[in-house]
C-alpha cells in the first residue's frame, strides 16, 4: 500500500530548491530522479538545465508518481542539473537534482614504506596504503596479512579531499609487538565497482639488531 498525503502548498515530497540533491549515476544503469509527489494527479515536467526537457516515453524514461522519473538506461546526456517542475494553483514549484558521474577509476595505489620491511621482534608495524582516485570516485580498501585469522591488525581509514582534482584515501594498518608468525606478505587491495588494484610488501622479522 502506498498512501499519498495531498498538500497543495507542497507538491513534492522532498523539496531541494536551496541546494540540489546530488545523485550519483553510472552510464548504462537505471537512474531515478526521485521527485515523487504528494498527489498522483500532479503533472510534473523534467528539465535539464538550461535548455532541454526530458519527455517520458514510457520506455527509457518513465514517470512514476510514487518514485519520480525512472531513466532505465542513463547516458552522459543526463549528467547535469535536472529540475522537476510542477504548477499547482498557478504557482510554479521546483526541486533540483545534480547528477554526478560515478567513476570507478583508481589512479594509483601505494604502500608508503620501504620494501621489503625489516623489523625487530616486539616492535610495532605501521603500513600506510594510499589510493588516489578522481573526485567522483569511492573505494573499498582491505588488507590481507599472515596472521589475519587472529585479527592481529588494527586499521584506520581517512580521506583527504583538499586536493581540487583528486581524492586520496588512506588505510593505515598497525600491528603491535610483532612476532615471527607476523612475517610474510602484506597486501592492500583497493576496489571501486569493477575496478581493482592491489599492492604488496614483504615483512621480515629479526631477533637481534643486526638488520
Amino acid at each position: 500500500i502506498y498512501i499519498f498525503i495531498s498538500d497543495t502548498g507542497r507538491p513534492f515530497v522532498e523539496m531541494y530548491s536551496e541546494i540540489p540533491e546530488i545523485i550519483h549515476m553510472t552510464e548504462g544503469r537505471e537512474l531515478v530522479i526521485p521527485c515523487r509527489v504528494t498527489s498522483p494527479n500532479i503533472t510534473v515536467t523534467l528539465k535539464k538545465f538550461p535548455l532541454d526537457t526530458l519527455i517520458p516515453d514510457g520506455k527509457r524514461i518513465i514517470w512514476d508518481s510514487r518514485k519520480g522519473f525512472i531513466i532505465s538506461n542513463a547516458t552522459y546526456k543526463e549528467i547535469g542539473l535536472l529540475t522537476c517542475e510542477a504548477t499547482v494553483n498557478g504557482h510554479l514549484y521546483k526541486t533540483n537534482y545534480l547528477t554526478h558521474r560515478q567513476t570507478n577509476t583508481i589512479i594509483d595505489v601505494q604502500i608508503s614504506t620501504p620494501r621489503p620491511v625489516k623489523l625487530l621482534r616486539g616492535h610495532t608495524l605501521v603500513l600506510n596504503c594510499t589510493a588516489t582516485t578522481p573526485l567522483n570516485t569511492r573505494v573499498q580498501m582491505t588488507w590481507s596479512y599472515p596472521d589475519e585469522k587472529n585479527k592481529r591488525a588494527s586499521v584506520r581509514r581517512r580521506i583527504d579531499q583538499s586536493n581540487s582534482h583528486a581524492n586520496i584515501f588512506y588505510s593505515v594498518l598497525t600491528i603491535d609487538k610483532m612476532q615471527n608468525k607476523d612475517k610474510g606478505l602484506y597486501t592492500c587491495r583497493v576496489r571501486s565497482g569493477p575496478s581493482f588494484k592491489s599492492v604488496n610488501t614483504s615483512v621480515h622479522i629479526y631477533d637481534k639488531a643486526f638488520i
Partner: antibody, heavy 116, light 110 residues
C-alpha cells in the same frame, strides 16, 4: 587538472569571419555544457553562447544571434565558435568556459580584433 | 546595459567586511541559482560562489554568498589586499534563455 586552451583569434576586417577553437583536457568533456563568454577591452563580462553536453541544444545572446554558431566535437574534446559578419563591437577576449556548478573553469582566452 | 545591476565600485580597508549587491528580476535571480566570479587584474575570471552560497574547494571562507527574492549579495570579511579585483554576479534567465551578468564591481582595498 582541467585545462581549456582557446585558439583562432586575430585581427580581422569588419564583415570578415573567424573560427575560434577550444581544446579541453583533464575532464570528461562530453559530460559538460560549454559556454563562450567575451570581454571587450576595459568592459565587463558578456555571455555569448552555450551548447549542451550532447550538442543537441544551443542558445545565443541577442548581440550575436544569426552571426555566430557554436558547435562541439566530443570525440576531439573540442568546442568551436564560428563568427561571421564581424563588427567592431565584437572586439574582445573570448573565453571558453566549462559549465556545471556554475561557470566552473575558464580558459585564458583568445583575442579577437575587428578593425579596418 | 547589464540585466543584473551591481554597484560599479566598492572599497574597504584590510580586515574590514565589504558587501557587493546584485539585483535582477523574477526570471533570472528570482527563479535560478546565482554564481559569483572574481577577476584579478590581467587574468581570466574564476568561480567564487555557486548555487547562491556554495564555495568551490580552495575558495577561502571569508567569501560568502546569499540570495533573497530577486537580489543576491557577496560578502567578503577580513578584507585582504589580494582581494582587489573585479567581481561579477551571473544567473540564467528563463524567459529569454540566456546567461546574464552584472556589470561588475571593482573592489579597491585602501
Amino acid at each position: 587538472e582541467v585545462q581549456l586552451l582557446e585558439s583562432g583569434g586575430g585581427l580581422v576586417q569588419p564583415g570578415g569571419s573567424l573560427r575560434l577553437s577550444c581544446e579541453a583536457s583533464g575532464f570528461i568533456f562530453r559530460d559538460y555544457n560549454m559556454n563562450w563568454v567575451r570581454q571587450a577591452p576595459g568592459k565587463g563580462l558578456e555571455w555569448v553562447s552555450i551548447i549542451t553536453n550532447d550538442g543537441s541544444s544551443t542558445a545565443y545572446s541577442d548581440s550575436v544571434k544569426g552571426r555566430f554558431t557554436i558547435s562541439r566535437d566530443n570525440s576531439k574534446n573540442s568546442l568551436y565558435l564560428q563568427m561571421n559578419s564581424l563588427r567592431a563591437e565584437d572586439t574582445a577576449i573570448y573565453y571558453c568556459v566549462k559549465v556545471y556548478y556554475g561557470m566552473d573553469d575558464w580558459g585564458q582566452g583568445t583575442t579577437v580584433t575587428v578593425s579596418s | 546595459q547589464s540585466v543584473l545591476t551591481q554597484p560599479p565600485s566598492a572599497s574597504g580597508t584590510p580586515g574590514q567586511r565589504v558587501t557587493i549587491s546584485c539585483s535582477g528580476g523574477s526570471s533570472n535571480i528570482g527563479s535560478n541559482y546565482v554564481s559569483w566570479y572574481q577577476q584579478l587584474p590581467g587574468t581570466a575570471p574564476k568561480l567564487l560562489i555557486y548555487f547562491n552560497f556554495q564555495r568551490p574547494s580552495g575558495v577561502p571562507d571569508r567569501f560568502s554568498g546569499s540570495k533573497s527574492g530577486t537580489s543576491a549579495s557577496l560578502a567578503i570579511s577580513g578584507l585582504q589586499s589580494e582581494d582587489e579585483a573585479d567581481y561579477y554576479c551571473a544567473a540564467w534567465d528563463d524567459r529569454v534563455n540566456v546567461w546574464v551578468f552584472g556589470g561588475g564591481t571593482k573592489l579597491t582595498v585602501l
